[in-house]
């Protein structure tokens, strides 16, 4: 059964920069990537980014910067706001439509106890939500 | 027909701040992302950045962070682009063009709004 | 910022030739680059999206090619009409970037 994994990093220099990681752990070639935060995409969720792995990237503030890490994962910057910790309690989500899957979610936040430059361990949270 | 009609020209002076309009007709309004686009005389084009009408989610070019500022009306159907603490190199033509996310390209743009900054 | 380079300010042409516009990025964007027409005095207009397809209603003597970090944009059987600055866009990255522009001009 594919899975997909979500990691959130709060930056040891910045304490108020974080970085959102996923990726997608199964057969199949990913077809998009939507990142939202306040959870999951269409279901209270706020889009904060669309990947396309060849026509690019949309991306709403907070995001800073989206991009492919690898052909299964991605990154998600988030903008200094200021304040410290200000995505702390944060959920972020990602789903990958994937073919012939179907689509895949996933959300995480950083770890309460996190210290800066940890993050939360690669372990997907699934949200059941297979199209 | 889906058109996009912006606000006509407009001269002002350095130091202060301008709205341009950008109403869009013949499509659902918030169905599509709006973008704005700069074009200094005789230049090419800078991205300036885009906002989602559904929810006013924006994404600025960090070039114009501190210049523009991107707002919608749903009710009329508008997105409006608010310019700041104008100088003369903020003179060009104004473009805002719709954002087709089914195929990723800008697929309408509107005629544009000259902005000429002199004292 | 990923830097798209029109090399070709200026291309001179004569209306029923073969003309080919390029355009090259600064790091490898896949296909994620259009075409936009800007006739004098007019505002931009899309050709090309995605690398290759046309936009709705642009005549098929406009072709789009490439993917990576080279794109193409041509025009078979220039007419009087295509005069016009070109312009390519990638949307790979934020922010996204246009390329200066290519004047062509008809003989």
């Known amino acids: 059964t594919p899975e997909v994994w979500v990691q959130v990093q709060m930056e040891a220099t910045e304490l108020s920069s974080f970085t959102v990681h996923c990726g997608f752990l199964g057969p199949g070639s990913i077809s998009l990537v939507t990142v939202s935060w306040g959870g999951p995409d269409g279901a209270g969720g706020t889009k904060l980014a669309v990947l396309h792995p060849e026509l690019g990237t949309r991306q709403w503030a907070p995001a800073r910067q989206a991009r492919w890490e690898t052909q299964s994962s991605i990154s998600l910057a988030l903008e200094d706001s200021g304040a410290s910790s200000p995505f702390a309690n944060t959920t972020f989500c990602c789903k990958f439509a994937s073919f012939p899957e179907g689509s895949w979610e996933s959300c995480g936040s950083l770890p309460p106890s996190s210290d800066p430059g940890l993050s939360a361990p690669p372990t997907p949270v699934p949200i059941l939500r297979a199209d | 027909e889906v058109q996009l009609q912006q606000s006509g020209p407009e001269l002002v002076k350095p130091g202060s701040s301008m709205k341009i309009s950008c109403k869009a007709s013949?499509?659902?309004?918030?169905?599509?992302?709006m973008d704005w686009v700069k074009q200094s005389h005789g230049k090419s084009l800078e991205w300036i950045g885009a906002?989602?009408?559904?929810?006013?989610?924006?994404s600025y070019n960090q070039k114009f962070k501190d210049k523009a500022t991107l707002t919608v009306d749903r009710s009329s159907s508008t997105a409006y682009m608010e310019l700041r603490s104008l100088t003369s190199e903020d003179s060009a033509v104004y473009y805002c063009a719709r954002w087709d996310s089914d195929y990723w390209y800008f697929d309408v743009w509107a005629t544009g709004t000259t902005v000429t900054v002199s004292s | 910022d990923i830097v798209m380079t029109q090399s070709q300010k200026f291309m001179s042409t004569s209306v029923g030739d073969r003309v080919s516009i390029t355009c090259k990025a600064s790091q490898n964007v896949r296909t994620a680059v259009d075409w936009y027409q800007q006739k004098p005095g007019q505002s931009p207009k899309a050709l090309i999206y995605?690398?290759?397809n046309r936009h709705t209603g642009v005549p098929d003597r406009f072709t789009g090619s490439g993917s990576g970090t080279d794109f193409t944009l041509t025009i078979s059987n220039v007419q009087s009409e295509d005069l016009a600055d070109y312009f390519c866009l990638q949307h790979w990255n934020y922010p996204y970037t246009f390329g200066g522009g290519t004047k062509l001009e008809i003989k």
């Open positions: 906002i989602n009408p559904n929810n006013g989610g924006t």
């Open positions: 995605s690398a290759s």
């Open positions: 013949g499509y659902t309004f918030t169905d599509y992302s």
